[in-house]
Interface confidence: medium
């Protein structure tokens, strides 16, 4: 004597108060988990969206983005404009990163160049409004005895002094 | 949490009874799955009718026992089973129950002429 | 209506052994709407299995439930004195008339 509304399975809901307990989800709707009192509606893929996955009768439809959009927020809930690398989007569109910042990605914000001097470090390759600047070795890396690339000096046996 | 079933009773052919389940610790104004079954003596369980309290949603009955047989919610803690043009193959003890898993003593109602 | 039909009465067993009890549905049970009862003389029903195979709260491992569609089985092993009760099967069908049917009941006994 199970309450049966409760233990309708996935793809159906409980429709009671006609000749089934438990009735198909009608189409374009959908109830992923049992004991459902309503199906819910599919989700539609229009305009800048398109389907990545069709709804089901237990599982409803997944969108993404047409080319030239990405997708963001929860299950693809928004679709925002690409720009090109060394551009973020604007109210009033795409708009070149100013000098000082880049942007790798179709998608994101312009952000400052890493301060190479901030790790005592210097710029080994300048920044791009696309590309990162590539910090190099610290200045005195550079001085003579100082690389971790010069062998070390042969060990000295002790009491013997330098010559 | 226990229910209750009262109101069995001795009655002629043709009589009418009301059988009333009681509910301690269950607020049937919430949504639950309530049935009556019965069990005529030395024999087994026969199942009546099933209603959802709390809702107005079509009870459920065996084909023998509709439009003779009315299960309804009367209160907050009450379920009932009305029964019409009673017969001696009615004769048995009426148990109450909620989703299978808590049920009443029971009830016996006699039909006897 | 539905008809459920189960291992005939009585079965007799022993302390410590297993028991099967089969039950056979007229129409597929909807969903695995299926549950097993015990009941012992002047008592309620108690439900040990549901959704087929789904152990009730407090009841003890040694009560099986398997089986989908029209066939279904209870199975008791280490058998105990107390499990000597007439066991009941009960299908769900997707009609809001006759929903539920019960088995004609099989006693355990022990020999």
């Known amino acids: 004597l199970q309450d049966l509304c409760s233990n309708c399975p996935a793809g159906t809901f409980c429709d009671n108060n006609r000749s089934q307990i438990c009735s198909p989800c009608p189409p374009n709707s959908f109830s992923s988990a049992g004991g459902q009192r309503t199906c819910d509606i599919c989700r539609q893929c229009k305009g800048v969206f398109k389907t990545r996955k069709e709804c089901s009768s237990t599982s409803n439809a997944e969108c993404d983005c047409i080319s030239g959009y990405h997708c963001l927020g929860a299950e693809c809930s928004m679709c925002e404009q690409d720009c090109k690398q060394g551009q973020e989007l604007t109210k009033k569109g795409c708009k070149d990163c100013c000098f000082g910042t880049f942007n790798d990605q179709k998608r994101g914000i312009c952000r400052p160049w890493t301060n190479c001097s901030l790790d005592g470090k210097s710029v080994l390759v300048n920044g791009t409004k696309e590309r990162d600047v590539v910090c190099g070795p610290s200045p005195a890396d550079l001085s003579p005895g100082a690389s971790s690339a010069t062998p070390p000096a042969p060990a000295r046996e002790p009491g013997h002094s330098p010559q | 949490e226990s229910l209750e079933e009262s109101g069995g009773d001795l009655v002629k052919p043709g009589a009418s009874l009301t059988l009333t389940c009681t509910a301690s610790?269950?607020?049937?104004?919430?949504?639950?799955?309530m049935c009556w079954v019965r069990q005529a003596p030395g024999k087994g369980l026969e199942w009546i009718a099933c209603?959802?309290?709390?809702?107005?949603?079509?009870p459920h009955y065996a084909s023998w026992a509709k439009g003779r047989f009315t299960i309804s919610q009367t209160s907050s803690t009450t379920v009932t089973l009305q029964m019409t043009s009673l017969t001696a193959a009615d004769t048995a003890t009426y148990f109450c129950?909620?989703?299978?898993?808590?049920w009443g003593p029971g009830t016996l109602v006699t039909v006897s002429s | 209506a539905q008809v459920l039909t189960q291992t005939a009465s009585p079965v007799s067993a022993a302390v410590g052994g297993t028991v099967t009890i089969n039950c056979q549905s007229s129409?597929?049970?909807?969903?695995?709407?299926f549950s097993w009862y015990q009941q012992k003389p002047g008592q309620p029903p108690k439900l040990l299995i549901y959704?087929?195979?789904t152990l009730a709260s407090g009841v003890p491992s040694r009560f099986k439930g398997s089986g989908s569609g029209t066939q279904f089985t209870l199975t008791i092993s280490d058998l105990e004195c107390d499990d000597a009760a007439t066991y009941y099967c009960?299908?769900?069908?997707?009609?809001?008339?006759?929903?539920?049917?019960f088995g004609g009941g099989t006693e355990v006994e022990f020999k």
């Open positions: 209603m959802y309290t709390g809702s107005r949603d079509t």
């Open positions: 009960a299908g769900g069908y997707n009609t809001v008339t006759d929903t539920f049917a």
């Open positions: 129950a909620r989703e299978g898993n808590l």
């Open positions: 610790g269950i607020d049937f104004s919430r949504r639950y799955y």
């Open positions: 959704s087929a195979s």
């Open positions: 129409q597929s049970v909807y969903s695995n709407w």
